[in-house]
């Protein structure tokens, strides 16, 4: 009775259960009752990352420098190349097919999380007591100057975009 289903890491072909090719190898010829599945290693620029019956290996991803990409991890016969973005850029998608410049946080906003090769800058509004007067991809909100610690008084209140302005205390006349 020919099988209708096969074990794990096998496939059904013409009423016969054949072993799948291991990761890093492609199928050359199906098995027979007398011969094992014939598999061949993928070439240097190719890979297969699963147990498979593919007759062609997949090409490694190309990290195109014209798109701001660079190699993060070189591919093997069993893994694809992993691309990341050059300094100052991040991926536009999870598959990282192209890069865009990191976002800068506008005045009134500070950097909550600095961008990486795969994620953009995360900005946050400067809370009361903090400010940012620059457009920056790495500067956090800075605290207002404490006039008191300098024996000065606030002459002009701070905002989320400006620091306080300190000045000398008015001397009381005797």
């Amino acid at each position: 009775e020919p099988p209708t289903a096969c074990r794990e890491k096998q496939y059904l072909i013409n009423s016969q259960c054949c072993s799948l090719c291991q990761p890093g190898q492609k199928l050359v010829s199906d098995c027979t009752e007398f011969t094992e599945t014939e598999c061949l290693p993928c070439s240097e620029s190719e890979f297969l990352d699963t147990w498979n019956r593919e007759t062609r290996c997949h090409q490694h991803k190309y990290c195109d420098p014209n798109l701001g990409l660079q190699v993060q991890q070189k591919g093997t016969s069993e893994t694809d190349t992993i691309c990341t973005c050059e300094e100052g850029l991040h991926c536009t998608s999870e598959s990282c097919e192209s890069c865009v410049p990191h976002r800068s946080c506008l005045p009134g906003f500070g950097v909550k999380q600095i961008a990486t090769g795969v994620s953009d800058t995360i900005c946050e509004p400067c809370p009361v007591g903090f400010f940012s007067n620059v457009s920056s991809a790495f500067e956090k909100c800075r605290p207002w100057t404490s006039c008191e610690t300098k024996d000065l008084v606030v002459q002009q209140a701070g905002t989320n975009k400006t620091d306080v302005v300190c000045g000398p205390q008015d001397r009381q006349r005797a």
Epitope: N14, T32, F34, T35, E36, E38
Partner: antibody
Framework: QVQLVESGGGVVQPGRSLRLSCAAS????????MHWVRQAPGKGLEWVAV????????YYADSVKGRFTISRDNSKNTLYLQMNSLRAEDTAVYYC??????????WGQGTMVTVSS | EIVLTQSPGTLSLSPGERATLSCRAS???????LAWYQQKPGQAPRLLIY???ARANGIPDRFSGSGSGTDFTLTISRLEPEDFAVYYC??????????FGGGTKVEIK
């Protein structure tokens, strides 16, 4: 390169025995089934026997069943055909051939067996 | 046992002509497991076609196989001098035995 080389042929009297060998090189011999196919002078091809890659399964043509035995030694990359009780009609060139799902893709050059008194 | 009948027994043609060889099976050949071999005098057979229509490695595209079930054809589109030989079909679906056809000799006219 991938190669099969038969040896052991010769002239033998009816009723006697002969052992043919087939030396394999250039491929993983222990992963392939192997066949013996023969060709009588001026005639067509006749399949004789097959053995599975690990030597467990063996099938024979009715014309040789009970007289011929196919075997293999994977450590020596060699296929054998033990031929007993030889008859005049066993006179032929004997070829070994590699089994695949694509048919017999590699053949040896053949060895001549002549059964004559 | 599947019996394979090849026709014609001999085909006399000139170089450049088209050759059509037939192989008929006594019952259906499962999965089209039918191969064609070429044999020249004093040489071992050489695999040309497998699975009824797939060319083996290194075989020129003037050789083509077709058919399924019980009727199969080997076509040589334009005969080259080196193509004059004997051609055998073989089924490897239903065994034992693996059976060969009787052969077709393609000779120079």
């Amino acid at each position: 390169q991938v190669q099969l080389v038969e040896s052991g042929g010769g002239v033998v009297q009816p009723g006697r025995s002969l052992r043919l060998s087939c030396a394999a090189s250039g491929f993983t011999f222990g992963s392939y089934g192997m066949h013996w196919v023969r060709q009588a002078p001026g005639k067509g091809l006749e399949w004789v026997a097959v053995i599975s890659y690990e030597g467990v399964k063996k099938y024979y043509a009715d014309s040789v069943k009970g007289r011929f035995t196919i075997s293999r030694d994977n450590s020596k990359n060699t296929l054998y055909l033990q031929m007993n009780s030889l008859r005049a009609e066993d006179t032929a060139v004997y070829y070994c051939a590699r089994d695949t799902s694509r048919g017999h893709d590699i053949w040896g050059q053949g060895t001549m067996v002549t059964v004559s008194s | 046992e599947i019996v394979l009948t090849q026709s014609p027994g001999t085909l006399s043609l000139s170089p450049g002509e088209r050759a059509t060889l037939s192989c008929r099976a006594s019952q259906s050949v499962s999965y089209d497991y039918l191969a064609w071999y070429q044999q020249k005098p004093g040489q071992a057979p050489r695999l040309l076609i497998y699975g009824a229509s797939a060319r083996a490695n290194g075989i020129p595209d003037r050789f083509s196989g077709s058919g399924s079930g019980t009727d199969f054809t080997l076509t040589i589109s334009r005969l080259e001098p080196e193509d004059f030989a004997v051609y055998y079909c073989q089924q490897y679906a239903d065994y034992p035995p693996f059976t060969f056809g009787g052969g077709t000799k393609v000779e120079i006219k």
